[in-house]
Amino acid sequence: KGEQISFRDCAEVFKSGHTTNGVYTLTLPNSTEEVKAYCDMEAGGGGWTIIQRREDGSVDFQRTWKEYKVGFGNPSGEYWLGNEFVSQLTNQQRYVLKIHLKDWEGNEAYSLYEHFYLSSEELNYRIHLKGLTGTAGKISSISQPGNDFSTKDADNDKCICKCSQMLTGGWWFDACGPSNLNGMYYPQRQNTNKFNGIKWYYWKGSGYSLKGTTMMIRPAGF
C-alpha cells in the first residue's frame, strides 16, 4: 500500500501536478487534523489557498469565536477556512495574501500583501501585514498595525462599542476600522449606505457593501 501524500496548502497541491480548481484536503505537518479548502489553480499562476469567500449571502458569517477558529461554510461557495489552521500555516513559512473584490457595477480590484501571518489564539489571531500593492486602494483597508480578531462573543477591538456585534461578522476590527469582509451580505440596490455590510473603505468608501470577496494565500517564493 502506497504512502499517503498530504499537502499543507494549495501550492503543494499544485506542485504535485493537481492543477485543476477545486476542493482539496489539506493537512499541516505533524498533524492529523484535516481541513477542506478551495484551491485556485488558475489566477496569477495558481497555487492559491482560499481562506475566505463571499459571493451570494448563502452563509451566515455572524459566528462565534470557536466557529471562526475551526472554520465554517462550504469550500465550494461561501466559507471561512479557520483562524487556527491559517495561523499555524502562516507561521511555518512566509505567505502572501491577495484579496480580490467585486462591486455591483461589474468592477473588480485587488489588494496584495507581500507578507501575511496570524498570531496564535493566545494573541487573539492578530493580523500582521506588510507591503501593499494593488488596485483596491493605496492605503490598507485592514488597519495597520494589525488588530486582534473579534467575534460576537469575543470583543477584542479598540472601540468603546462592540464592533463585531454592531457591524456583524468576525474581523480584525479597530474602532471599527476601514474594512469588514465578513459583514452582512446585501443584495444589489440595497448595498449602499450600509455601515454593517461587506466593506473595503479605500476602494468603495464607507457605506458600500460589496458583491463578492475572496481572500487567498500562497507561499511568497511560489
Epitope: 472601540c159 454592531m166 474602532a175 476600522g177 440595497q190 454593517n196 455590510g197 464607507s206
Partner: antibody, heavy 122, light 112 residues
C-alpha cells in the same frame, strides 16, 4: 487615552467673529468625522456642524449656515469652527465631539471636549 | 427636522429604586440596515455629555450594566435598574437616522 482639548471661547460683540479650536490626541484623528454641538445657558444640546474624516463632506444646522465654517487640519490633529456675524442667540457652551466609529460612520458621539463658553453681548 | 420628545422632564428617584425615561420621535428611526440610530447621553453637573447607549440598545464600554436601552421605530426607553447617587444629571436622547441630528429636551434625574 482619547482627549479633545478646546480653546478660543470668550466674550464678543454682536456681528463680530470668533474662532474655536479643538486639539485631538490619543487616536488617529484623520480617520474620524467630527462635530460641533452647543448648549445655550440652562438649555439642552443642539447640533451645529459636521465634517467628515477627510474634510470632503460638511453639514451645518440651518441656524448657523452661511455664518459658521467648520474645518480641520489632519496634519495638526485639530478641528476648528470659524464663527462670523455672531448673534446673541449664539451664546452657548460649544463642544467638539468625535464620532463613535471611524471612517465616517455616523452612530453618535463617543468622546466630547470639555466645552468652551462663547458669550455674544454688547 | 425630527422632533425628539422626552418624558418626564424631571425625575426624582430614591437610591436603589428603578428609573425609566421615555423618548419619542416624530418619525421612525429605523434605518434600512435594521438599526435605530438612537443614542442616550448623560450630562453630569458641570461636565460634558457622555455616551451611554448607542444604536438604541448597545451599552458603551465602561457604562454600568444597570443602564439599558430598548425600543424601535418611534418609541425608546432608557432604564436604570437601581439608581445610584452618581447617576444624577440630565439625560438626553439623540437621533441620527435623519439629517440633521436632533436631541430631546433632556430629563433631569435627581435623588430624593
Amino acid at each position: 487615552e482619547v482627549q479633545l482639548v478646546q480653546s478660543g471661547g470668550g466674550v464678543v460683540q454682536p456681528g463680530r467673529s470668533l474662532r474655536l479650536s479643538c486639539a485631538a490626541s490619543g487616536f488617529t484623528f484623520s480617520s474620524y468625522g467630527m462635530h460641533w454641538v452647543r448648549q445655550a445657558p440652562g438649555k439642552g444640546l443642539e447640533w451645529v456642524s459636521y465634517i467628515s474624516s477627510s474634510g470632503s463632506t460638511i453639514y451645518y444646522a440651518d441656524s448657523v449656515k452661511g455664518r459658521f465654517t467648520i474645518s480641520r487640519d489632519n496634519a495638526k490633529n485639530s478641528l476648528y469652527l470659524q464663527m462670523n456675524s455672531l448673534r446673541a442667540e449664539d451664546t452657548a457652551v460649544y463642544y467638539c465631539a468625535r464620532d463613535l466609529l471611524d471612517y465616517d460612520i455616523l452612530t453618535g458621539y463617543g468622546y466630547w471636549g470639555q466645552g468652551t463658553l462663547v458669550t455674544v453681548s454688547s | 427636522d425630527i422632533v425628539m420628545t422626552q418624558s418626564p422632564l424631571s425625575l426624582p428617584v430614591t437610591p436603589g429604586e428603578p428609573a425609566s425615561i421615555s423618548c419619542r420621535s416624530s418619525q421612525s428611526l429605523l434605518h434600512s440596515n435594521g438599526y435605530n440610530y438612537l443614542d442616550w447621553y448623560l450630562q453630569k453637573p458641570g461636565q460634558s455629555p457622555q455616551l451611554l447607549i448607542y444604536l438604541g440598545s448597545n451599552r458603551a464600554s465602561g457604562v454600568p450594566d444597570r443602564f439599558s436601552g430598548s425600543g424601535s421605530g418611534t418609541d425608546f426607553t432608557l432604564k436604570i435598574s437601581r439608581v445610584e447617587a452618581e447617576d444624577v444629571g440630565v439625560y438626553y436622547c439623540m437621533q441620527g437616522t435623519h439629517w440633521p441630528p436632533t436631541f430631546g429636551q433632556g430629563t433631569k434625574l435627581e435623588i430624593k
